[in-house]
């Protein structure tokens, strides 16, 4: 059959949940301390919450069906009546003294047709403020007559027919009901939510909803013209120019901020805004939701996305409405006839009307910013330059942070990127330029996405004109090749000797792309003599150990994950691994990741790596004296051509620092 | 079969210099590494130097360091061990020892040794 | 420095039976890349020089009769004669070349019981 509407899927599991009570039985979740009663979805049933509220559960007949006196359950269908008195059934009682009272609509009720009633609960009518049940009452009950006639519709309509969005035709004056039928399950006339649906009459159907609903007569534009407290809003409307959307056609939501949710924000950031016809345009959108949504609608945190782009959190607490958790919203479900507004007293504004400055302010990188505001550079983070700002996490500084030198000043420079970019448009090996006139290097990895050392830790925030990029640490832009790196840090005098030796420099100083697990003097000095003069008194074998502790990719700690094979330009792979913030290679932790390099990263290691082929039993176990001689005597020629090699001028370098 | 015969021992007064030789045969002198080890009378063995198949890596232990020199001659197949300001506790017999093979490794062959005498 | 130290100072066995002989290192000799041992046993006989029995810990040189036998990883080691002949009467010593200085244990004198 046709698939099932989300109010039926919701009945259904309702259903289901009640079903060991008897046939036709349905679980209701009642929120504790009020008469709000639902039938409950899964999550609803698990949570036991409705709005942050405790629920409990009860067990009642399904709709249409009743209890049999020594039954279990409810085996009975109710007895079909006619509209009137099926008012009376469903608990509608005032509904039916009310027709009573207007004379001529209890035997329309009564007699032949077909109708649709929403039917107002008791709790509805008592629930209207006591002017307007006056004003009902009175004029000989004309209005009284027109009020029941627009919860009318002419024919029968079951709730599979109510869609979301639709519009039913009314029999006061052929006025609108505003029908929302939300994937919760949970169906609105007006923003009146549907308590019991279905009830069938002999002549048509009546549906119990918690509200007393009225016609709709202005859109969402001329009730922000009508009312005062949308002051700054009618103005901000007007300059944006979306007046024409919010009279027109179409189901929104305004979240309409009242004059005092404009006075919040500070007038330097609201006369940028309201003086910004791009910003303000993406401040208004984002207070315009694509769909109505009516507060009833709300039993839980819901995203939903603006026409500017951003989501927000909606979400309830009891009886008030939240938005992204606070309590802002002063004045619900105002019915309009291309919509709903709610007023907030709070100012939603996106990230895309903000300078860079402002988008720092909510996020975890203050310590960076003061820094950059020292150093000088906060015009370039309150302007119109199209820019993207690197900042680093405050735990970044949790040490203490530089003082501001002329290298300090530098190094943030090199945090500003010349560009607005947007992180999911960057891409492997691409340079971005700096203020300081450096070229980072993107690095895309399969978990991060790293400028340089430094990877993005959290979503983009972009701006009217700037970017920001959230980062997991301080970035350094690279001073030179990997062999400038090495030659410029007496950690590696022996290393870069090694290198020297192999034939290795010119791999390490050209372009290229190299991960460098680098041996301090320590670690050379660490091996056993017999495996240090095994590695260093053979050019080739010290190439191949070398060859070893080169990747083949540009790899820094923020790229590897949990764990990653890197290729060796020796041929092997190494195991770079990263727990509880430590790099290791090998399962050897690294002393220091992330020294960058034009060419390459180095890691600084305090052990020399050995590849997989070197680590295999010595000739010397297996062979016995004469066998050795022979392995000795045959390859001596290949000995004779390495020795000047091995004698070359850079091993008296060695020599020195070898020297026990 | 490999021989090492070591010369040069005698008596030196304290302070005094003593260059120890060892001749080296039966095998390629330049394939291996090379050390010098001495035991003082009655008492165990106590490594000396060291010097590499090339004669680039040479290691002293902290006892002689500064005043021994060790080196090697190829094309004479010869070991040397120059000693400078030597002290009564250096007196031993010093043996000059082959490694296994090119690499520093344990001590594979001995030689019978020479003694070393400092005294006034 | 790495410190050797060898125990019994002294031994005595009967002939054809087992002899024992222990040596521990300050620091563990075993080099993990290569899962190496770097320790060597050396027997020196009165008025000659050493000679080399054992390398590895557990490798016998070529030669070594194979009554002698070499144990142990890490810092404890073992050199085992499963039945001791009158020319086995000598001085044994346990070295380490794991890291300079090369180090020597004190010795083990091995007698006739």
């Known amino acids: 059959g046709p698939a099932k509407s989300p109010y039926q899927l919701v009945l259904q599991h309702s259903r289901l949940r009640g079903r060991q009570h008897g046939p036709n039985v349905c679980a209701v979740q009642k929120v504790i301390g009020t008469n709000r009663k639902y039938f409950t979805n899964c999550k609803q049933w698990y949570q036991r919450k409705i709005c942050g509220k405790s629920t409990v559960i009860s067990y009642e007949c399904c709709p249409g069906y009743e209890k049999v006196p020594g039954e279990k359950g409810c085996p009975a269908a109710l007895p079909l009546s006619n509209l009137y008195e099926t008012l009376g059934v469903v608990g509608s009682t005032t509904t039916q003294l009310y027709t009573d009272r207007t004379e001529k609509l209890r035997p329309e009720m009564e007699g032949p047709g077909s109708f649709t009633i929403f039917a107002p609960s008791n709790e509805a009518w008592a629930s209207l403020p006591a002017e307007v049940l006056d004003s009902l009452v009175s004029n000989v009950n004309i209005e009284l007559l027109n009020a029941l006639r627009y919860h009318m519709v002419g024919r029968r309509v079951l709730t599979d027919e109510l869609k979301h969005g639709m519009t039913l035709t009314s029999m006061y004056q052929n006025s609108n009901i505003q029908i929302h039928h939300y994937p919760n399950g949970i169906v609105t006339v007006n923003c009146a939510r549907l308590l019991k649906a279905d009830h069938h009459a002999t002549n048509g159907v009546v549906h119990l909803i918690d509200k007393v609903i009225s016609t709709i007569t202005n859109n969402i534009q001329q009730i922000i013209e009508i009312e005062d407290t949308f002051e700054t809003l009618r103005a901000a409307v007007a300059a944006s120019g979306l007046n024409t959307m919010l009279e027109g056609n179409g189901q929104y939501t305004l979240l309409a901020p009242t004059n005092e949710a404009f006075e919040k924000i500070p007038s330097e950031t609201l006369n940028r805004i309201l003086g910004d016809p791009e910003a303000l345009r993406d401040l208004l959108n984002n207070h315009i939701l694509k769909s109505a949504m009516c507060a009833e609608a709300i039993v839980a945190g819901l995203s939903v996305e603006t026409l500017e782009g951003t989501t927000l959190e909606v979400g309830c607490s009891g009886d008030m409405l939240t938005i992204n958790g606070k309590a802002i919203i002063s004045n619900k479900d105002i019915l309009a006839t291309n919509g709903v507004i709610h007023y907030i007293d709070e100012l939603l504004i996106p990230d895309s009307a903000k300078t860079l400055f402002e988008l720092a302010a909510e996020s975890d990188v203050s310590t960076a910013i003061d820094l950059f505001r020292q150093a000088g550079l906060g015009n370039h983070l309150s302007g119109s330059e199209r820019l993207t700002l690197l900042a680093p996490l405050n735990s970044v500084f949790k040490d203490g942070t530089p003082p501001i030198d002329a290298h300090t000043r530098n190094l943030l420079r090199n945090h500003i990127i010349k560009d607005q970019l947007a992180s999911k448009y960057l891409y492997h090996g691409q340079t971005l330029e700096t203020l300081g006139g450096k070229k980072l290097r993107v690095f895309v990895y399969r978990n991060s996405l790293c400028i340089e050392n430094s990877c993005i830790a959290a979503h983009d925030k972009r701006g009217r004109y700037g970017t920001l990029f959230t980062m997991d640490r301080v970035l350094t832009p690279p001073m030179g090749t990997v062999m400038d790196v090495l030659k410029g840090d007496n950690r590696f005098s022996m290393l870069v000797a090694a290198i020297q030796s192999a034939g290795l420099t010119e791999t390490l100083n050209r372009e290229g792309v190299y991960t460098v697990f680098a041996p301090t003097n320590e670690a050379f000095r660490a091996l056993p003599p017999r495996e240090r003069s095994r590695l260093l008194g053979d050019a080739k074998e010290l190439a191949n150990i070398l060859k070893y502790h080169i990747g083949d990719e540009i790899l820094v700690s923020g790229g590897i994950g949990a764990l990653v094979r890197l290729k060796s330009l020796q041929g092997d792979k190494l195991e770079v691994s990263l727990k509880n913030n430590v790099v290791s290679v090998n399962k050897e932790p690294v002393a220091e990741p992330d020294i960058m390099a034009t060419n390459g990263v180095v890691h600084v290691i305090t052990n020399v790596l050995q590849p997989p082929a070197n680590r295999p039993q010595e000739r010397g176990d297996e062979l016995a004296d004469s066998a050795l001689e022979i392995f000795k005597q045959a390859s001596a020629f290949s000995r004779a051509s390495q020795r000047s090699v091995r004698l070359a001028p850079v091993y008296q370098k060695l020599l020195e620092r070898m020297k026990h | 079969q490999v021989q090492l015969v070591e010369s040069g021992g005698g008596l030196v007064k304290p302070g005094g210099s003593l260059r120890l030789s060892c001749a080296a045969s039966?095998?390629?002198?330049?394939?291996?590494?090379m050390y010098w080890i001495r035991q003082a009378p009655g008492k165990g063995l106590e490594w000396v130097a060291t010097i590499s198949d090339g004669g680039i890596y040479i290691y002293y232990a902290d006892s002689v360091k500064g005043r021994f020199t060790i080196s090697r001659d190829s094309a004479k197949n010869s070991l040397y061990l120059q000693m400078n300001s030597l002290r009564a506790e250096d007196t031993a017999v010093y043996y000059c020892?082959?490694?296994?093979?090119?690499?520093?490794?344990?001590?594979?062959?001995w030689g019978q040794g020479t003694t070393v005498t400092v005294s006034s | 420095d790495i410190v050797m130290t060898q125990s019994p100072d002294s031994l005595a066995v009967s002939l054809g039976e087992r002899a024992t002989m222990n040596c521990k290192s300050s620091?563990?000799?075993?080099?993990?890349?290569?899962?190496?041992?770097?320790l060597a046993w050396y027997q020196q006989k009165p008025g000659q020089p050493p000679k080399l029995l054992i390398y590895?810990?557990?490798t016998r040189e070529s030669g070594v009769p194979d009554r002698f036998s070499g144990s142990g990883s890490g810092t404890d080691f073992t050199l085992t004669i499963s039945s001791l002949q009158a020319e086995d009467v000598a001085v044994y010593y346990c070295?380490?070349?794991?890291?300079?200085?090369?180090?020597f244990g004190q010795g083990t004198k091995l007698e006739i019981k």
């Open positions: 620091q563990s000799l075993l080099y993990s890349s290569n899962q190496k041992n770097y």
């Open positions: 039966g095998f390629t002198f330049s394939d291996y590494y």
């Open positions: 070295q380490q070349y794991y890291r300079y200085p090369y180090t």
């Open positions: 020892v082959r490694g296994w093979d090119r690499y520093d490794s344990w001590f594979a062959c």
């Open positions: 590895w810990a557990s």
